[in-house]
């Protein structure tokens, strides 16, 4: 009889206790493989769940979450409330990310900003609640004449980092000194 059971197709169940062994799954139940002893009750997508795929006699229903919620777990076994970017879900609801952390999604937790200095880099763009910091070239890469594999930083808003201001000031000073000595040297030649 075991061999006969394997002849029962998906959408039926198998009963060894009688000669006619295959029975159709009752409404709202399914068997996704042949030879099953029972049909499984169809999943019902209720409450915060909505139906993504209807149940059939050979496959279970599939659920999604309603608007404002997102799936968690295998086969969307749970729905969790969405938060805004820059927030995380706590037991008391959605809370803003603390200073020094960010969340760029509607789900998950706030994560610390990247520490650029650990990689020997400088902060190019400050972090926010919604966005991580953007690390720029290392201070060594900013010295004059040094070649760098780091691509040029995109144009950005005012509020430059101290390293860039220092570099610009230094460059300006050197250029001014060079000009000053060139002028002096030119005047000396004139006097002769």
């Amino acid at each position: 009889l075991q061999d006969l059971c394997s002849n029962c197709p998906a959408g039926t169940f198998c009963d060894n206790n009688r000669s006619q062994i295959c029975s159709p799954c009752p409404p709202n139940s399914f068997s996704s493989a042949g030879g099953q002893r029972t049909c499984d009750i169809c999943r019902q997508c209720k409450g915060v769940f909505k139906t993504r795929k209807e149940c059939s006699s050979t496959s279970n229903a599939e659920c999604d979450c309603i608007s404002g919620y997102h799936c968690l777990g295998a086969e969307c076994s749970m729905c969790e409330q969405d938060c805004k970017q820059g927030q995380e879900l706590t037991k008391k609801g959605c809370k803003d990310c603390c200073f020094g952390t960010f969340n760029d999604q509607k789900r998950g937790i706030c994560r610390p900003w990247t520490n650029c200095s650990l990689d020997g880099k400088s902060v190019l763009v400050n972090g926010t609640k919604e966005r991580d910091v953007v690390c720029g070239p290392s201070p060594a890469d900013l010295s004059p004449g040094a070649s760098s594999a780091t691509p040029p930083a995109p144009a950005r808003e005012p509020g430059h980092s101290p390293q860039i201001i220092f570099f610009l000031a230094l460059t300006s000073t050197v250029v001014l000194f060079l000009l000053f000595f060139l002028v002096l040297d030119y005047k000396d030649d004139d006097d002769k």
């Epitope: 998906a10 006619q20 029975s23 159709p24 409404p27 709202n28």
Partner: antibody, heavy 114, light 107 residues
Framework: EVQLVESGGGLVKPGGSRKLSCAAS????????MHWVRQAPDKGLKWVAY????????YYADTVKGRFTISRDNAKNTLFLQMTSLRSEDTAMYYC???????WGQGTTLTVSS | NIVMTQSPKSMSMSVGERVTLSCKAS??????VSWYQQKPEKSPKLLIY???NRYTGVPDRFTGSGSATDFTLTISSVQAEDLADYHC?????????FGAGTKLELK
């Protein structure tokens, strides 16, 4: 909305042949087994045949075995019943139904008479 | 083959009355019994499956009960629109079999 629409019925002489069709919509046809059930005038319902979702398993009522052939075209969402060697007792309204037997078509009438 | 026997063959009721229809199986069919309503010139509609589960959209005045060989469909307060034939059927084994039906008429 689930819909099952039978067609192909009509008047046939005894010994003749006919092919019934059942067009399915509103559900994933390829995931359901399908039945044909008939009802003679002023009589009860009689199950005729079953085909599994993929077409690999087929059952027939003893009264139609060897004369009727159930088949399906999942690409076209259509169920068929090829009937041969028809008899007067095959006169009935023929319904198709999903294997859950929860939705039935409106039926198509077959009359076998000389 | 499993034989399903329905009784009575017909019954006349007044609106608001309680109706009990019977269906007996010739052998144990567990709870694999369904009840169908068929109005004149229409196809059958599923009311109850698994002996006692009301199908989607079916009014709660319809109740199914029973197991093994004895099954009952109860209409707690019959309405004019319930005028129809009622069929029981078993899906415990092939061939699927149905009762001859009970005709419900209104007085």
């Amino acid at each position: 909305e689930v819909q099952l629409v039978e067609s192909g019925g009509g008047l046939v002489k005894p010994g003749g042949s006919r092919k019934l069709s059942c067009a399915a919509s509103g559900f994933t046809f390829s995931e359901f087994g399908m039945h044909w059930v008939r009802q003679a005038p002023d009589k009860g319902l009689k199950w005729v045949a079953y085909i599994s979702s993929g077409g690999s398993t087929i059952y027939y009522a003893d009264t139609v075995k060897g004369r009727f052939t159930i088949s399906r075209d999942n690409a076209k969402n259509t169920l068929f019943l090829q009937m041969t060697s028809l008899r007067s007792e095959d006169t009935a309204m023929y319904y198709c139904a999903r294997d859950w037997v929860d939705y039935w078509g409106q039926g198509t009438t077959l009359t076998v008479s000389s | 083959n499993i034989v399903m026997t329905q009784s009575p063959k017909s019954m006349s009721m007044s609106v608001g009355e309680r109706v009990t229809l019977s269906c007996k199986a010739s052998e144990n069919v567990g709870s694999y019994v369904s009840w169908y309503q068929q109005k004149p010139e229409k196809s059958p509609k599923l009311l109850i499956y698994g002996a006692s589960n009301r199908y989607t959209g079916v009014p709660d005045r319809f109740t199914g009960s029973g197991s093994a060989t004895d099954f009952t469909l109860t209409i707690s307060s019959v309405q004019a629109e319930d005028l129809a034939d009622y069929h029981c059927g078993q899906s415990y084994s092939y061939p699927l079999t149905f009762g001859a039906g009970t005709k419900l008429e209104l007085k």
